[in-house]
Interface confidence: medium
Amino acid sequence: TSISPGRCKWNKHTLTYRIINYPHDMKPSAVKDSIYNAVSIWSNVTPLIFQQVQNGDADIKVSFWQWAHEDGWPFDGPGGILGHAFLPNSGNPGVVHFDKNEHWSASDTGYNLFLVATHEIGHSLGLQHSGNQSSIMYPTYWYHDPRTFQLSADDIQRIQHLYGEKCSSDIP
């Protein structure tokens, strides 16, 4: 779910991110891998660079909460709403919340954190929902094997519309 309407983007290409706390049922190392892989999905097709920080402020702040958690968008227990994120032009850019009451995993059991994080970080970068069922920004959760997951052409077109294409590292 995205919070705050309107097309928007970050006005810089290097973004820091921080994982503030962790769910009950995933090892912190697995959570870190899932979030790293999620931001990499977006940096692979844009000039964006993501840098993880352990302390202090960050552009993108990932956290796990349950029920009402003071942002006006309460979670609803297991199932239903999995997460939400605030768009760059909102009052809270970069805030990404996941429902702590979900069974999060790095596999096909419960909800795959990498897939949901890719969706929510898409919102954090300025993407709204897509009506294309093959898009990671489609509002309903669908499981894909994370090892073979790729953004749809729709996702790539929309994120590159905001940030441009990834510069080639090849020097002729």
Partner: antibody
């Protein structure tokens, strides 16, 4: 700079009324639930009241229910606490506070305003 | 309501000492535990949130740990500006409740 600034405290007789205000600046006030927390002299911190970002829902500690009313004006970036039927035990420093979106903790506090209820 | 019990209520220490304050919740609160520092005549300042996350701008000598019902705030090497009162607070359920405070005084 993110800031909260309370005003309206003072000396009042038991049974009297006061209205506290809290002016917010430096952040998008309308996005945040806001709180009043109080601290009696030499004592700990006690939650008093809470209001949703839209102002549509409010909560009160049992000790003030029916006597205090929290409200907000998002167009003025201001939070209020109307305190009626004041008692000696309401004597405290009253703080307005914001709960951070990514901390779920009181990350911004006002400087506090002293309310003294005495005859 | 969830009761928060802090111990000790006061302690005396010297500059450079390692200081540990504990907080116990009356029921499990996962990692929904925050720590604040308050100096006389001032509002509290957030030190630690989500049990172990250091608030931006807070010195790294402060650290938090724990989960469930038992939590700890540690100051690895006490500095003159650290003499203050420390409060824990749970944000697991409404009403948000605070511990009674721990006053850290100079020996």
């Amino acid at each position: 700079e993110v800031q909260l600034l309370e005003s309206g405290g003072g000396l009042v007789q038991p049974g009297g009324s006061l209205r506290l205000s809290c002016a917010a600046s430096g952040f998008t006030f309308s996005f945040y639930a806001m709180w009043w927390v109080r601290q009696a002299p030499g004592k700990g911190l006690e939650w008093v009241s809470r209001i949703y970002s839209s102002g549509g829902k409010t909560w009160y500690a049992d000790s003030v229910k029916g006597r205090f009313t929290i409200s907000r004006d998002n167009s003025k970036n201001t939070l209020y606490l109307q305190m009626n039927s004041l008692r000696a035990e309401d004597t405290a420093v009253y703080y307005c506070a914001r709960v951070g979106m990514s901390t779920y903790a009181f990350d911004i506090w006002g400087q506090g305003t002293m309310v003294t209820v005495s005859s | 309501d969830i009761q928060m019990t802090q111990s000790p209520s006061s302690l005396s220490a010297s500059v450079g000492d390692r200081v540990t304050i504990t907080c116990r919740a009356s029921q499990s609160i996962s990692d929904y535990l925050n720590w604040y520092q308050q100096k006389p005549g001032k509002a509290p300042d957030l030190l630690i949130y989500a049990a172990s996350s250091l608030q931006s701008g807070v010195p790294s000598r402060f650290s938090g740990s724990g989960s469930g019902t038992d939590f700890t705030l540690t100051v690895s090497s006490l500095q003159p500006e650290d003499f203050a009162t420390y409060f824990c607070q749970q944000s697991y359920s409404i009403p948000l409740t605070f511990g009674g405070g721990t006053k850290v005084e100079i020996t």
